[in-house]
């Protein structure tokens, strides 16, 4: 969590006097101290971990998790189930696929239970926080005797993610970046024989099913280039892995998917 | 590499005022999983904890029961640095005074400063 | 508040000597018990951390066990830089951070 230093000299302040072990446990800071805030993820839409920053307790607390969704069949509230630890003390909550409901709004509240009443509620759009796996298989071909062509693949519905290519020659002091939206395939049209390229693909939710900021860890990176031999079979013997996009991908432009979909389906 | 370098005087007459200051580097008197605290240490008394100040969006501060009255900790974060004052000495709080932090999720004292021993006499 | 009792207050040992040192607290404080070691004239030096976590750096002749109230401290074979002054510290239930009253490590 970062912090923002509301006075130029610290003198803003909460005084918190503990007094006798008679005194009332909503002594003033406890009950005043903010709780710390919850971050949560969806992973590939098949975990979702909620985290917070443990360590800004000023004492060892086991701060507990409920949940719900507002407005909604599924608005009981749920008790955690699945701590997350640091030090023995949680630090999170992780929830399973079949607690997960993107297109409804989740709200996370987070509770001392030395002190109940010391709460914080935060509602959260899941779909603007799922962050899918690395794409994976990455593959090259040849179009013709200059023009590369990179194929992907992902392990979810492709038509909701678009990507991020970035490729360099062994020349090169940095990055070249190029946009793809959900076609999961990328194009290189010149290139130079003389010359070793690496490329490396991430992902992210959107912008069709969802407003996900984060993006992908970065693909395994693949090389093509002048230390391999034109009788390489691997320039050659891809197309197995490669995959044109269905009609049932291509065909997906509204903003939601379906919770099945969302909870069995996987393309590869 | 944390460090914490006390500075202060080492005579105090009875019924004025003690102040000491902790000058911190390599880590902000505004960390949200910190706490900067005094102790002091003395024959009779041993070590004992007088309180903490904290930053959580806002500034926190904790006072232990015996020196609650008498006490201020106060954090500046223009010097990165948090002072302790304790008003009304007697020669009981004639003392060795250390800063030290601590931090979350294991909760230890790892870093204190190097001690300041405060008489308290006429 | 919880207090922090230790036994003994002073012991004697030689050079080689295997040395056990107890905490007690009134109250359960899970495993969240530090132990320092302090010299004349120096800060108190963090040895054992969470009762018996190893602080980077110390030798592995210290070990500590224990959880709830009752806890030890133990010096498999002391060596001639061991005899010091050792505390146990409580962070379960802050405020007020609580000491042990000491335990004073002296060659016999």
């Known amino acids: 969590l970062n912090t923002t230093i509301l006075t130029p000299n610290g003198n803003e302040d909460t005084t918190a006097d503990f007094f006798l072990t008679t005194m009332p446990t909503d002594s003033l800071s406890v009950s005043t101290l903010p709780l710390p805030e919850v971050q949560c993820f969806v992973f590939n839409v098949e975990y979702m971990n909620c985290t917070w920053n443990s360590s800004s307790e000023p004492q060892p607390t086991n701060l507990t998790l409920h949940y719900w969704y507002k407005n909604s069949d599924n608005d009981k509230v749920q008790k955690c189930s699945h701590y997350l630890f640091s030090e023995e003390i949680t630090s999170g909550c992780q929830l399973q696929k079949k607690e997960i409901h993107l297109y409804q709004t989740f709200v996370v509240q987070l509770q001392d239970p030395r002190e109940p009443r010391r709460q914080a509620t935060q509602m959260l759009k899941l779909q603007n926080l799922v962050i899918p796996w690395a794409p994976e298989n990455l593959t090259l071909h040849k179009l013709s005797e200059s023009q590369l062509e990179l194929n992907w693949n992902n392990r979810f519905l492709n038509h909701c993610l678009e990507h991020l290519v970035q490729y360099r020659t062994d020349w090169d002091h940095s990055w070249t970046e190029q946009s793809v939206d959900y076609r999961h395939k990328f194009s290189l049209p010149s290139v130079d024989g003389q010359k070793r390229y690496t490329f490396r693909v991430r992902s992210r939710f959107n912008p069709l099913c969802g407003s996900a900021q984060h993006w992908s860890e970065w693909s395994h990176p693949i090389h093509w280039g002048s230390n391999t031999s034109k009788e390489n079979p691997f320039l050659f013997a891809l197309e197995a892995e490669q995959k044109l996009i269905s009609e049932e991908d291509l065909g997906g432009e509204q903003k939601l998917i379906s919770e099945e979909d969302l909870h069995h389906h996987h393309h590869h | 590499q944390v460090q914490l370098q006390q500075s202060g005087p080492g005579l105090v007459k009875p019924s004025q005022t003690l102040s000491l200051t902790c000058d911190i580097s390599?880590?902000?008197?505004?960390?949200?999983?910190?706490?900067w605290n005094w102790i002091r240490q003395s024959p009779s008394r041993g070590l004992e904890w007088l309180g903490r100040?904290?930053?959580?969006?806002?500034?926190?501060?904790d006072y232990a029961v015996s020196v609650k009255s008498r006490i201020t900790i106060n954090p500046d974060t223009s010097k990165n640095q948090f002072s302790l004052q304790v008003n009304s000495v007697t020669p009981e709080d004639t003392a060795v005074y250390y800063c030290?932090?601590?931090?979350?999720?294991?909760?230890?004292?790892?870093?204190w400063g190097q001690g300041t021993l405060v008489t308290v006499s006429s | 508040d919880i207090q922090m009792t230790q036994s003994p207050s002073s012991l004697s040992a030689s050079v080689g000597d295997r040395v056990t040192i107890t905490c007690r607290a009134s109250?359960?404080?899970?495993?969240?018990l530090n132990w320092y070691q302090q010299k004349p004239g120096k800060a108190p030096k963090l040895l054992i951390y969470?009762?018996?976590s190893l602080q980077s750096g110390v030798p592995s002749r210290f070990s500590g066990s224990g959880s709830g109230t009752d806890f030890t401290l133990t010096i498999s074979s002391l060596q001639p830089e061991d005899f010091a002054t050792y505390y146990c510290?409580?962070?379960?239930?802050?405020?007020?951070?609580?000491f042990g009253q000491g335990t004073r490590l002296e060659i016999k």
């Open positions: 109250q359960s404080i899970s495993s969240y």
């Open positions: 510290q409580q962070s379960y239930s802050t405020p007020p951070i609580t």
């Open positions: 030290a932090r601590m931090t979350g999720p294991r909760y230890y004292f790892e870093y």
């Open positions: 969470a009762a018996s």
């Open positions: 390599g880590d902000s008197v505004s960390s949200n999983i910190a706490t």
């Open positions: 100040t904290y930053y959580r969006s806002k500034w926190y501060k």
